[in-house]
Interface confidence: low
């Protein structure tokens, strides 16, 4: 059976396509090519007479077509208008005509796309952003990339307009991108330059550092305030409710007890219109605030070595303190079997070994004062040597 095959089937605009013919009958007078799915004289491209080896152009000939003795048709410099069906009619010597129809599709070489956005400075948790991939072209697949990865499945990401528009619902500060769109057709692909979002957010609750509360008279007080914000926050300081200065850092040299009080950092984002404050108490004192003696307790004071575990707990009613542990005048933990938890209030030893026997105590401290617990004695016993497989050691 007479057939035709397009090589290639998908053709890039400006390239060439060859309409190959298979199973061409032996005894022929000639053949003709037509544009379309049927034989139509008004749409004949070319006719070829075998006897004279003469090609004759038809009404639909554009000057870009070449017919070969094997009936194949070459079309050069194709345009999108060339897309469609082509019909070959062969006139056999028995005067029985045979026809075969083939087709090909011409696609444009795609340009480099670009991304347009309805809002390049969205506000976090408030705005939606619609990205559109330009230009709009027919028979084109639109793909999107975020951080060089394909789109994750998320209810906040919505594709529309044939995937040409990507809508990001309720943006967050993590949605900065970069975003890229890629356009594809069967013959070409091109990716846009990356676009980033400038997500306006914050300020978050500011943090004042350092965390110290107690200071000695004569020291320098240097406080720094930071709040995550875009654009960066504007900062101001208040002491005991009275405005001091509009800076991110506050420096007071040679402080006295009169500098004790409430230090407030105020962070403002002029774009979002949001404000956040943090208050820190500063105490300037010669005296060491008395830290009460902590209490130490053990889950058990006599344990079996290599078998039992023990928890030591250091209890204090003071606030704003830190806790450290000591064993035989060495700070803990000293081995992987020792773990501190719950803000260092609990020391866990698992399992207990012979070398863990001895005196333990804890110490609570703040920048100004400290106090130690009474010591507690941990005794470690060992049972008779374990026997393997019920056999006496030999």
């Amino acid at each position: 059976q007479l057939t035709t095959e397009s090589m290639p089937f998908n053709v890039a605009e400006g390239k060439e396509v060859l309409l190959l013919v298979h199973n061409l009958p032996q005894q022929l007078f000639g053949y003709s090519w037509y544009k379309g799915e049927r034989v139509d004289g008004n749409r004949q491209i070319v006719g070829y007479a075998i006897g004279t080896q003469q090609a004759t152009p038809g009404p639909a000939n554009s000057g870009r077509e070449t017919i070969y003795p094997n009936a194949s048709l070459l079309i050069q410099n194709v345009t999108q208008n060339d897309t469609g069906f082509y019909t070959l009619q062969v006139i056999k010597s028995d005067l029985v005509n045979e026809e075969a129809t083939g087709q090909f599709h011409v696609y444009p070489e795609l340009p480099k796309p670009s991304i347009s956005s309805n809002n390049s400075n969205p506000v976090e948790d408030k705005d939606a952003v619609a990205f559109t991939c330009e230009p709009e072209t027919q028979d084109t697949t639109y793909l999107w990339w975020i951080n060089n990865q394909s789109l994750p499945v998320s209810p906040r990401l919505q594709l529309s307009n044939g995937n040409r528009t990507l809508t990001l619902l309720s943006v967050t500060r993590n949605d900065t991108g970069p975003y890229e769109c890629e356009i594809q057709n069967p013959v070409s692909a091109n990716r846009s330059d990356p676009v980033t979002l400038n997500v306006t957010y914050g300020p978050d609750t500011p943090t004042i550092s350092p965390s110290d509360t107690y200071y000695r008279p004569g020291a320098n007080l240097s406080l720094s305030c930071y709040a995550a914000s875009n654009p960066p926050a504007q900062y101001s300081w208040l002491i005991n409710g009275t405005f001091q200065q509009s800076t991110q850092e506050l420096f007071i040299p040679n402080i006295t007890v009169n500098n004790s009080g409430s230090y407030t950092c105020h962070a403002n984002n002029s774009v979002t219109g949001c404000n956040r404050t943090t208050v820190k108490t500063i105490i300037v004192t010669e005296l060491s605030p008395v830290v009460a003696k902590p209490q130490i307790k053990a889950s058990k004071t006599t344990v079996t070595g290599d078998k039992d575990s023990v928890n030591l707990t250091c209890s204090t009613n003071d606030t704003g303190i830190s806790i450290r542990w000591f064993f035989k005048n060495q700070s803990l933990p000293s081995s992987e079997r020792m773990k501190l938890s719950q803000g260092n209030t609990t020391l866990s030893i698992n399992p207990v070994k012979r070398e863990d026997a001895g005196t333990y105590w804890c110490e609570v401290f703040n920048p100004i004062s400290k106090n130690q617990s009474d010591p507690i004695m941990l005794n470690v016993n060992y049972n008779a040597l374990p026997q393997e497989n019920g056999l006496s050691p030999g």
């Epitope: 948790d125 408030k126 705005d127 939606a128 499945v153 998320s154 209810p155 906040r156 919505q158 619902l169 309720s170």
Partner: antibody
Framework: EVQLLESGGGLVQPGGSLRLSCAAS????????MSWVRQAPGKGLEWVSV????????YYADSVKGRLTISRDNSKNTLYLQMNSLRAEDTAVYYC??????????????WGQGTLVTVSS | QSVLTQPPSASGTPGQRVTISCSGS????????VSWYQQLPGTAPKLLIY???KRPSGVPDRFSGSKSGTSASLAISGLRSEDEADYYC???????????FGGGTKLTVLG
């Protein structure tokens, strides 16, 4: 205590309109996405619509698109559902529900007691 | 016809363990979190499980959720008479751009 209180339900003729309200209290309303979910008598739950906490994102079930409109007034801590061109199949108890995840992992942790909408001639 | 498929009914005796299934597709359960809701007769639904397996505070640990592929399950152990209710699964569906529920499972506590 989180409370969601729907109102505005009642009997309405086919083709008619109704506006449901959901008054929220006990939480910062503007921080939460809100949904309407309905339940026809003796039937299961059917999600109707969701609105993001800022109101910038809205989705509808296909069965109500073009007829029902969700909105919110964060200054009044109130969620609304404007119902137009009502049909008999819109007869249901309408619940408002809160999504605590801002749509990142949609779920409904608090529900109102519901308000009954009956569409009948 | 619900997008998520649940058995219409389930039953068990007090103390038993009962499992309710919920089947979906990659556009919902397969790529999104599943929630489970309990609706006692004449009341509004109550959240039992969210994010596939997490329990809100106040929900007994007798209730547990799990997910594998495009299916999810709710398990109730130590069944009690007060567990008699309708149970619904739900998830976001990216192809519908909306939330979808299962048709609901009526749980009966026998005896």
């Amino acid at each position: 205590e989180v409370q969601l209180l729907e109102s505005g339900g009642g009997l309405v003729q086919p083709g008619g309109s109704l506006r449901l309200s959901c008054a929220a209290s006990g939480f910062t309303f503007s921080n939460y996405a809100m949904s309407w979910v309905r339940q026809a008598p003796g039937k299961g739950l059917e999600w109707v619509s969701v609105i993001s906490h800022g109101g910038g994102s809205i989705y509808y079930a296909d069965s109500v698109k073009g007829r029902l409109t969700i909105s919110r007034d964060n200054s009044k801590n109130t969620l609304y559902l404007q119902m137009n061109s009502l049909r008999a199949e819109d007869t249901a108890v309408y619940y408002c529900a809160r999504d605590p995840t801002k749509g990142y992992a949609p779920t409904f942790d608090y529900w109102g007691q519901g308000t009954l909408v009956t569409v009948s001639s | 016809q619900s997008v998520l498929t649940q058995p219409p009914s389930a039953s068990g005796t007090p103390g038993q363990r009962v499992t309710i299934s919920c089947s979906g597709s990659s556009s919902n359960i397969g790529n999104n979190y599943v929630s489970w809701y309990q609706q006692l007769p004449g009341t509004a639904p109550k959240l039992l499980i969210y994010a596939d397996s997490k329990r809100p505070s106040g929900v007994p640990d007798r209730f547990s959720g799990s997910k594998s592929g495009t299916s999810a399950s709710l398990a109730i152990s130590g069944l009690r008479s007060e567990d008699e209710a309708d149970y619904y699964c739900g998830a976001w569906d990216v192809s519908h751009n909306g939330y979808v529920f299962g048709g609901g499972t009526k749980l009966t506590v026998l005896g």
